[in-house]
């Protein structure tokens, strides 16, 4: 069940997704990848109010929960609903190939 | 890849599955739901150090970034990698209904 | 499996425009860093790099010919497109496609052969 | 746009025989240039990425080496399915450029 879109806290508060630049030094992959030099990484970000987004029963519990014991148990989390495929061109023993990554690139967010 | 299990944190730090006792009140499910009467939640909480229990390259990413840009990316968080089933027996219009949720408790856990 | 497949070569009148198709499988131009570009080699010669689209439908092109060329994409039928207009005789050559990613061509077409001929 | 200059432009040899192709680029390219081969009637084949890579499945008698202008192609052994046309191409900026060719054949 995909809640609610609107975010309680304010324009671009909750959770969303975001692209933030990366080196290949930033991402720690400078020995094991040639190319791309540069990724935009897009990620889940933003918080979970109540209702926002919830992934599913196990979100609408988590709220309802953390609203009870916010000392116990966590707000929802924003992460990654589903994911963008992306390419590297990456080091090998003998050379190079190009290998695709379906886990890398947040494609949409919800919250969970 | 399933990263490391060992929680630098110390025992039970780490994200992990837990159990919460909650009943149809707390879960704000009392107008709807006939039993159990109350539901022992399993949930995933707890910190997400460096490629603890990494989901995904995504997460590894996020560890990375996090480290770099703690104010702007957050560390990854720890949510359910799978579910288990639970039936709840359910008021309907015209009596009751057992119905099973594949979405609801929290079977194991990872870092995302 | 990786296969590009090349087709709309044939026989072209001076001034008139062609349109080439790719289509391809094995990979999908969503994912990022995969780009398909148009190669040609005209009879006897070397190859000469034309234009390629990139996931984010970024586009480039050879400086000399850039006025005639559109490269285009169909994302959902794994299809691209290369039209070249007021086409003369040194146009005449073969035309591959070719996979990228990133600087990588590493998967081409068979080819398909264009000639400008009244 | 960079020109790319390959030489020579034929050469003749015998299986077992090393071959040396250069390419120079009309300005620097760091390492970014590959090499295809083209056999008559058929598509190009990638070999060598980024000046030294050789790309997944290609033998280890190719390789490639040189940084900036100059750039070198080697085959340390010729085997009689090697006689081609080989291409250099700069992948440093667009307009991406190729060489004139090698054609490599049979003494």
């Known amino acids: 069940a995909r809640n609610g879109d609107h975010c309680p806290l304010g324009p671009g508060r909750c959770c969303r997704l975001h692209t933030v630049r990366a080196s290949l030094e930033d991402l720690g992959w400078a020995d094991w990848v040639l190319s791309p030099r540069e990724v935009q990484v897009t990620m889940c970000i933003g918080a979970c109010p109540s209702q926002f987004r919830a992934a599913n029963m196990h979100a609408q519990i988590k709220t309802s929960l953390h609203r009870l014991k916010p000392d116990t148990v966590p707000a929802p989390c924003c992460v990654p609903a589903s994911y963008n495929p992306m390419v590297l061109i990456q080091k090998t023993d003998t050379g190079v190939s190009l290998q695709t990554y379906d886990d890398l690139l947040a494609k949409d967010c919800h919250c969970i | 890849a399933r990263n490391g299990d060992h929680c630098p944190l110390g025992p039970g730090r780490c994200c992990r599955l837990h159990t919460v006792r909650a009943s149809l009140e707390d879960l704000g499910w009392a107008d709807w739901v006939l039993s159990p009467r109350e539901v022992q939640v399993t949930m995933c909480i707890g910190a997400c150090p460096s490629q603890f229990r990494a989901a995904n390259m995504h997460a590894q990413i996020k560890t990375s970034l996090h480290r770099l840009k703690p104010d702007t990316v957050p560390a990854p968080c720890c949510v359910p990698a799978s579910y288990n089933p639970m039936v709840l027996i359910q008021k309907t219009d015209t009596g009751v209904s057992l119905q099973t949720y594949d979405d609801l408790l929290a079977k194991d856990c990872h870092c995302i | 499996q990786v296969t590009l497949l090349e087709s709309g070569g044939g026989l072209v009148q001076p001034g008139g425009s062609l349109r080439l198709s790719c289509s391809f499988s094995g990979f999908s131009l969503s994912t990022y860093g995969i780009g398909v570009g148009w190669i040609r080699q005209a009879p006897g010669k070397g190859l000469e790099w034309l234009a390629h689209?990139?996931?984010?439908?970024?586009?480039y092109f050879n400086t000399a010919l850039k006025s005639r060329l559109t490269i285009s994409k169909d994302t959902s039928k794994n299809t691209v497109y290369l039209q070249m207009n007021s086409v003369r005789a040194e146009d005449t050559a073969v035309y591959y496609c070719?996979?990228?990613?990133?600087?990588?061509?590493?998967?081409w077409g068979q080819g398909t052969t264009v000639t400008v001929s009244s | 746009d960079i020109v790319m200059t390959q030489s020579p432009s034929s050469l003749s040899t015998s299986v077992g025989d090393r071959v040396t192709i250069t390419c120079k680029a009309s300005?620097?390219?760091?390492?970014?240039v590959a090499w295809y081969q083209q056999k008559p009637g058929k598509s190009p084949k990638f070999l060598i990425y980024s000046s030294s890579y050789r790309y997944t499945g290609v033998p280890d008698r190719f390789s490639g080496s040189g940084s900036g202008t100059d750039f070198t192609f080697t085959i340390s052994s010729v085997q009689p399915e090697d006689f081609a046309v080989y291409y250099c191409q700069q992948h440093y900026s667009t307009p991406w450029t190729f060489g004139g060719g090698t054609k490599v054949e049979i003494k």
């Open positions: 070719a996979r990228m990613g990133y600087d990588i061509m590493d998967y």
């Open positions: 689209i990139w996931w984010n439908n970024n586009k």
């Open positions: 300005q620097d390219v760091n390492t970014a």
